[in-house]
């Protein structure tokens, strides 16, 4: 088992005064283990959106190559970010508002070619990040799905979605259903065909919509389907609010597989106040759930910060160089390769938190309980058999807290120690690794913590 | 398979101009850079610039600015390099190479050279 | 711009010998080296990739390593077809692209 370290030695029964029998040692002193769930690719880490292929290739030596070869050379570095999928474009012909001239077969020539896009596929499988295509018809129109002629537009997705499975592509992003008529009926028959080509294909439907009551009938007769939602964005940046969405929507979903973002496509930033990036990291990382996130999260990226930007995509800051346009106005902390550099980095956190979130069982698959910790405060338990546990305590406030952790909140299988690793802060100055008494537990402003304890029997 | 094919060797008189073609075949030409190489004589290799066959933006060696340009034409899928004001020291074979972008952990793109043309050898000769 | 020094500048070996070139860069380029062989009256070809990534269809008897400002090239076993021209080239701080001035490698 990943759990138990000490070895099997094989004894038989009849040492046991039983009739021989062949069982382990491990069968005499640990309770048997739970059985792991089946587990799909995308709930092993995040997904990682690149709505605007021209955006994210940014200025320099990107600009060599077409948008999507240009993205097949970062390979590396979203390998780097331990990201499982990529979610991409649109990218199709879509002449705005005309159905006649949007061909959801033919990618745009200026972001490359079919050519161009199977080298992609095949990269990326060998680097084993899936590709996800977002076929979104009228991206570049007023109405995504071009509300007069629904039939016709629901049939193009329908022929899509066959050609783009067999063209070797793990799923599909649909956004701004909102706007599309009879949205539960059309996204059950193309999560048919999704499934139906393989049961390891994914279909994500993104709406802008934060009511519960609209995701859960959304969600209601698609049992597979990822929703990303504006459901999150409406918290107020608190902490009892944020734990009283979080838990409402997991017990209104009756704990099915969800997906943690604060939108269907934009950034962080558009929506939290930059000392608050670091919590959501932590947060969306560590919630039971696959969390999606935008090309430039990773880096506080702001289209606010770049003049002339657009709000939705704003060029992603490789390095210095990547907005020529006002000399200075970029500094190296607010680019990749700045922040690369920097242990005490956003981009830092960003790559610790996904790799724990790929590789831990607790954080992979483990049971989720909140419970109270004092006001101001979001703090919940990840845990999973006997594996190690965690504990992340996250202080949405403008104030220093003592946290009172209320462990009579929560179930006997999740009972919290007296002391817990402290694996890491969102902050700078404590000391990583450090066992912190539970009972004594302060955060700073904008503090969250990320602690280890190992399961007891 | 993809293919560069450059044009052949040129004889060229001091202070006259040189333009060598490589033609591009077997993957989609719009989609790559394409640099120009130049080697002199029993010298080493010698980076003169690159050109987008993508958007058509160029980046010259500093010690090329003004002498050199970089154009392409996509519906032939050729790449032209044009060397001005030759001098006896431009004399060498001049490569075409389609470059290739990779990137590493801290998101900076490196570029390789993944496939050549067979070379032109121009010899600048009063 | 970032300056390249391969050394030795030419060496002779057997046929089986292991035989290690190294490149040096004048400041830090990560792993933004890529390795080419050429040929008398050939092109460069590209052996080694982001310093130790093998171009495909290259023999693995070719690897390479390093990172930062030092990287080698080794060739395991010599085979009479390696008896060439060996260069590296960085691509980290570019423009400009650089090579070093290249190794001769001969047959002892």
């Known amino acids: 088992h990943h759990h138990h370290h000490h070895e099997q030695k094989l004894i038989s029964e009849e040492d046991l005064g039983g009739e021989q029998k062949l069982i382990s040692e491990e069968d005499l002193r640990a309770p048997r283990c739970r059985e792991l769930p089946a587990q799909k690719w995308w709930h092993t880490g995040a997904l990682y959106r690149i709505g605007d292929l021209q955006a994210f290739q940014g200025h320099g030596a990107g600009n060599l190559a077409a948008p999507i070869s240009g993205l097949k050379g970062r390979l590396d570095y979203l390998s780097s970010l331990k990201v499982k999928g990529l979610v991409l474009g649109p990218i199709h012909k879509n002449q705005k508002d005309d159905v006649a001239q949007t061909d959801l077969l033919q990618i745009d020539p200026n972001f490359g070619s079919k050519e161009d896009f199977d080298s992609l596929l095949q990269s990326a499988k060998k680097k084993s990040i899936r590709v996800i295509l977002d076929l979104t018809p009228n991206y570049r129109g007023e109405n995504s799905w071009f509300s007069t002629q629904v039939d016709t537009v629901a049939t193009k997705v329908k022929d899509a979605l066959e050609f783009w499975l067999q063209a070797g592509v793990d799923g599909f992003q649909v956004r701004d259903i909102e706007n599309l008529k009879d949205a539960s009926s059309f996204l059950a028959e193309w999560q048919n065909i999704t499934k139906g080509f393989s049961e390891d294909r994914l279909l994500i439907a993104g709406t802008n919509s934060s009511d519960l009551q609209q995701i859960l009938s959304l969600l209601e007769s698609n049992k597979d389907l990822l929703l990303t939602s504006s459901y999150l964005s409406d918290s107020g940046s608190t902490g009892e609010h944020t734990k009283s969405l979080v838990t409402q929507y997991l017990n209104a979903t009756g704990n099915r597989w969800c997906s943690w973002s604060l939108s269907q496509a934009r950034l962080l930033t558009s929506f939290l106040p930059a000392q608050l990036l670091r919590l959501y990291q932590l947060m969306l990382f560590t919630l039971p759930g696959t969390p999606v996130f935008s090309y430039g999260d990773e880096i506080g990226l702001d289209a606010a910060a770049l003049p002339g930007q657009p709000m939705e995509a704003p060029v992603m800051l490789w390095d210095e160089s990547s907005f020529p346009d006002i000399p200075g106005a970029v500094s190296a902390n607010m680019t990749v390769k700045g922040q690369s550099e920097d242990p005490g980095s956003l981009l830092s956190l960003f790559r610790r938190l996904s790799d724990q979130r790929s590789k831990e069982r607790s954080l992979l698959h483990g049971d989720f309980h909140a419970f109270s910790a004092g006001p101001g405060l979001f703090s919940y338990i990840r845990h999973w058999d006997q594996n190690e546990r965690f504990l992340v305590v996250l202080n949405f406030g403008d104030v220093g807290l003592s946290a009172g952790l209320q462990a009579s909140d929560l179930p006997a299988s999740a009972s919290l120690p007296a002391k817990a690793d402290l694996l890491l802060s969102t902050q700078p100055g404590r000391e990583e690794g450090s066992p912190l008494e539970l009972e004594r537990l302060k955060l700073e402003p904008h503090e969250g913590l990320l602690l280890r304890f190992p399961y007891a029997a | 398979q993809v293919q560069l094919v450059q044009s052949g060797a040129e004889v060229k008189k001091p202070g006259a101009s040189v333009k060598v073609s490589c033609k591009a075949s077997g993957y989609t030409f719009t989609s790559y850079g394409i640099s120009w190489v130049r080697q002199a004589p029993g010298q080493g290799l010698e980076w003169m610039g690159w050109?987008?066959?993508?958007?058509?933006?160029?980046n010259y060696a500093q010690k090329l600015q003004g002498r050199v340009t970089m154009t392409t034409d996509t519906s032939t899928t050729t790449a032209y390099m044009e060397l001005r004001s030759l001098r006896s020291d431009d004399t060498a074979v001049y490569y075409c190479a389609r470059g290739e972008l990779y990137s590493g952990y801290d998101g900076t793109l490196g570029i390789l050279f993944d496939y050549w043309g067979q070379g032109t050898l121009v010899t600048v000769s009063s | 711009d970032i300056q390249m020094t391969q050394s030795p500048s030419s060496l002779s070996a057997s046929v089986g010998d292991r035989v290690t070139i190294t490149c040096r860069a004048s400041q830090s380029i990560s792993s933004y080296l890529n390795w080419y062989q050429q040929k008398p009256g050939k092109a460069p070809k590209l052996l080694i990739y982001?310093?130790?990534s093998l171009q495909s269809g290259v023999p693995s008897r070719f690897s390479g390593s390093g990172s930062g400002t030092d990287f080698t090239l080794t060739i395991s076993s010599l085979q009479p077809e390696d008896f060439a021209t060996y260069y590296c080239?960085?691509?980290?701080?570019?423009?400009?692209?650089?090579f070093g001035q290249g190794t001769r490698l001969e047959i002892k």
């Open positions: 080239q960085q691509s980290y701080s570019t423009p400009p692209i650089t």
């Open positions: 050109i987008s066959a993508y958007n058509g933006n160029t």
């Open positions: 982001a310093a130790s």
